[in-house]
């Protein structure tokens, strides 16, 4: 018997006299694109050196990083069973499409959110006599796109009894924000800063007139707008 290391660094036994036609490999696309609110499929197929393996197995998907990232999905199949019984599905949104017995670990992700963007890694573990495991090193990058959505718009007190307006929008690609209002040319005064991740915030630093101020967010998938109103009480002359 000789030993070798698998992709996760574990020492594994392989029969010295076996000459497997296949070696361990995993096939995943570099990137998958999908829209927020929709579903995505993360394809993953594999080959392995254990001819006609029919023992117990576990299929795992994790996010973030290989080997150590948090699991988002896990299922186990009993010896001889075609059914992989789901043991973990984060937020109930991950469903195994593929049949691990047929070397397919493809996963469906439902009700996508922008926060689902990132890398996902598939892993299979043979837990019977042929104790072996393999995990994709590079994984598949899920890129969730979304039309703009304005998540917050507000008027806040500013310096010297003035007021300022803030608009925060999210989307992927990150949307461009623009302000318009009753004062001529005030949209050019918007200060745009990148928020965290897929959120963008734009500030209108000085609201000089009463009236309606509108924030517009736009990206290649669409546009959204929201308005706030400024009405100041002007005291009667003494």
């Amino acid at each position: 018997v000789k030993t070798r290391r698998d992709a996760s660094g574990d020492l594994l036994n392989t029969e010295a006299h076996s000459a497997p036609a296949q070696r361990w490999s995993m096939q995943v696309p570099a990137e998958v694109n999908a829209e927020a609110g929709d579903a995505a499929v993360l394809p993953c197929t594999f080959t392995h050196p254990h001819r006609h393996y029919d023992g117990p197995l576990t299929a795992i998907w994790r996010s973030g990083e290989p080997y150590a990232g948090p699991q988002v999905f896990r299922c186990t199949a009993a010896p001889g069973s075609e059914l992989c019984q789901t043991a973990l599905s984060l937020h109930g949104r991950f469903r195994l499409l593929g049949n691990p017995r047929r070397n397919d670990l493809s996963l469906r992700v439902e009700r996508l959110a922008l926060a689902d963007s990132g890398r996902y890694f598939c892993r299979v573990e043979f837990t019977g006599d042929a104790h072996d495991r393999y995990e994709s090193r590079h994984g598949v990058r899920l890129r969730v796109t979304a039309a703009p959505r304005i998540v917050n718009i507000s008027v806040l007190p500013g310096p010297a009894h003035a007021f300022r307006a803030l608009c925060t929008a999210e989307g992927e690609p990150p949307p461009a924000l623009a302000w318009s209002g009753p004062a001529p040319g005030n949209s050019s005064a918007a200060l745009q800063g990148q928020g965290h991740g897929y959120q963008v915030t734009a500030e209108l630093p000085a609201l000089t007139r009463d009236g309606r101020y509108t924030c517009t967010a736009a990206n290649s998938l669409g546009r959204a707008e929201a308005s706030v109103y400024l009405f100041r009480f002007h005291g009667a002359p003494g």
Epitope: A39, C84, T86, A87
Partner: antibody
Amino acid sequence: EVQVVESGGGLVQPGGSLRLSCATSGFNFNDYFMNWVRQAPGKGLEWVAQIRNKIYTYATFYAESLEGRFTISRDNSKSTVYLQMNSLRAEDTAVYYCTRSLTGGDYFDYWGQGTLVTVSS
Amino acid sequence: DIVLTQSPDSLAVSLGERATINCRASQSVTISGYSFIHWYQQKPGQPPKLLIYRASNLASGIPARFSGSGSGTDFTLTISSLQAEDVATYYCQQSRKSPWTFGQGTKVEIK
């Protein structure tokens, strides 16, 4: 052998209520999603509702036109799924089939024989 | 909702001949190479029976003369050599997006 047996159908007046039951055996009920699909006399198939299993938080899904009137539920200890139908209308007259689906696919791999619901005055 | 339109509505085929049924979706039902279209057979007085899942996978116990193909919006169910017991109505169904919807059905008869 997988068995799916519906019961509870019958004649009901418009505005009335009915509760359908679907008793299953021959498989591990907890591992599967369960559904109701209906077929009006001489017409095609219409998906009605789905209930997922514990891992999937027993999430329920409905055909939009039925939501609010119909409620799907399951009793894992009895391997049984139910469909509570309220405010019934003449257009709800159909054979109601109980179906099983795998957690990974919303297709229906086993069907019961169906139970006929007739809504008429 | 995704609308599935089957064609033809009915089909008469000689015994031993090929029968082809089409199913067109109002939008793509394929994601990353997976097509969420399934086919059922319903004989008179019986519940439907799963024939094909995800466009081309033969369900357990279904004869190999049944096959499915297609991607995107256009799908086909083929019976390579029609047998007397294949007389039935055939339905396609999509599970790309909820609510799951069915085609209107295609009735297959012997010519």
